[in-house]
């Protein structure tokens, strides 16, 4: 008789999840000499231990502490790039500007990027059929709690000038309900962080509006200022051109005023 299985509203665990996590860990530790000491089998065991045999709506940050400990990593605290709803461009940027880091450039972020996972209460099985959706089912699910935990720690580590890329094409350029708006903003440490520098990324080719005057940006400025952190904002009018000039700053089109 087939056992009854909880049906959740979200997609199930990414196929070949254990193999993917392990392979990513091995690749990351090979590329990053400072993380060569990491035992990837132990990392996988700690990752698995955070959600296997646990109710997928009852996961806590505490469940991820063994994994957090194994994945402890020092990135230059003044070279942190946060992002909201514009992940691809943020990652393209740090691939070019190699001394800056998004969360997904760290080991733990790299392991979990774009993956879904969950288990089942009282069984060691991974659920490949469905996992809880943050809105429709529950917020304390394995994926959401993981990102909340690593995002909080990443923000807490930041210092000096912290950069954030925001999507200027969205109706809410700054969204209080995003991970950036709900977690990272509130975990920047005012005694360490001098300024949050927001980069508003324009979508339209000839969009010369000052999106730094957007009401949601003013809301972000208010939240940040109340936390005793200075706020500044820049328009990135042509992200393609900006990336090109970061990559090839000596290019003649990058050294003459437009």
């Amino acid at each position: 008789v087939p056992r009854w299985r909880q049906q959740w509203s979200g997609p199930g665990t990414t196929k070949r999840f254990p193999e993917t996590v392990l392979a990513r860990c091995v690749k990351y530790t090979e590329i990053h000499p400072e993380m060569r000491h990491v035992d990837c089998q132990s990392v996988w065991d700690a990752f698995k231990g955070a959600f296997i045999s646990k109710h997928p709506c009852n996961i806590t940050e505490e469940d991820y502490q063994p994994l957090m400990k194994l994945g402890t990593q020092t990135v230059p605290c003044n070279k942190i790039l946060l992002w909201s709803r514009i992940k691809d461009l943020a990652h393209q940027f740090t691939q070019v500007q190699r001394d800056m880091f998004t969360l997904e450039d760290t080991l733990l972020g790299y392991l979990a990027d774009d993956l879904t996972w969950c288990g089942e209460f009282n069984t060691s099985k991974i659920n490949y059929q469905s996992c809880p959706d943050w809105r429709k089912d529950c917020s304390n699910n394995p994926v959401s709690v993981f990102w909340k935990t690593v995002s909080r720690r990443f923000a807490e580590a930041a210092c000096d000038v912290v950069h954030v890329m925001l999507n200027g094409s969205r109706s809410k350029i700054f969204d209080k309900n995003s991970t950036f708006g709900s977690v990272e903003v509130h975990n920047l440490q005012p005694e360490k962080v001098q300024t949050l520098e927001a980069w508003v990324i324009h979508g339209g080719r000839e969009d010369s509006r000052d999106l730094c005057q957007d009401p949601t940006i003013k809301e972000l400025e208010s939240i940040i200022s109340k936390r005793n952190i200075q706020f500044s904002c820049k328009n990135i009018y042509r992200p393609d051109k900006f990336l090109q000039c970061v990559k090839n700053p000596e290019d003649s089109s990058c050294t003459s005023e437009i």
Epitope: F231, C233, Y237, R238, C254, I258
Partner: antibody, heavy 119, light 110 residues
Amino acid sequence: VEESGGRLVTPGTPLTLTCTVSGIDLNSYAMGWVRQAPGKGLKYIGIMTSGGNIYYANWAKGRFTISKTSTTVDLRITSPTTEDTATYFCAREREFYGGGTSGSRLDLWGQGTLVTVSS
Amino acid sequence: AYDMTQTPASVEAAVGGTVTIKCQASQSIYNFLNWYQQKPGQPPKLLIYYASTLAFGVPSRFKGSGSGTEYTLTISGVESADAATYYCQQGWNSGILDNSFGGGTEVVVK
């Protein structure tokens, strides 16, 4: 661009410096205040943006207040100390576009006004 | 902050010689680097902006170069009129003002 109001004051006596502009729309340009102690380098105090936002250097917060009218940008030294003895410059900040984004330069400076704080 | 470090503090040059002044930012300023010239008793004058663009009326013997965090001002064929103090300034973020000017380089022409 012309600064005025510089004079000899005793420590603790508030002083307001005025930057008067002609032919410059303060709703279109930001104006910055920069100071230079005798024999020393340039030090940014603060800036009033065209939109009315004010940014101060961290060291200047609480010590200076910037405000503007339609043709002037004022710098108030709230409680001067001898360390505030300097020439105070007002400068226009001009935004320009390049590399897919924008930056700024200080393209027009006043002659400066000398403030001496002494008991 | 975008702390600007300028070297050397002072340099001597012979007429007709070449002077090189370096400016380093603590973080990338994406070519938004300005150079100013200041003579005694005068306000600073904009010399170069956007790392290499000459301001109006500035002679071509002044040349700006660099990118990212490292920038250079070169004066070729130095003239006695070039005796002054030169300052770099980051123009990337005008909301971050601490140490946005370099410490200055005095150029003495022999």
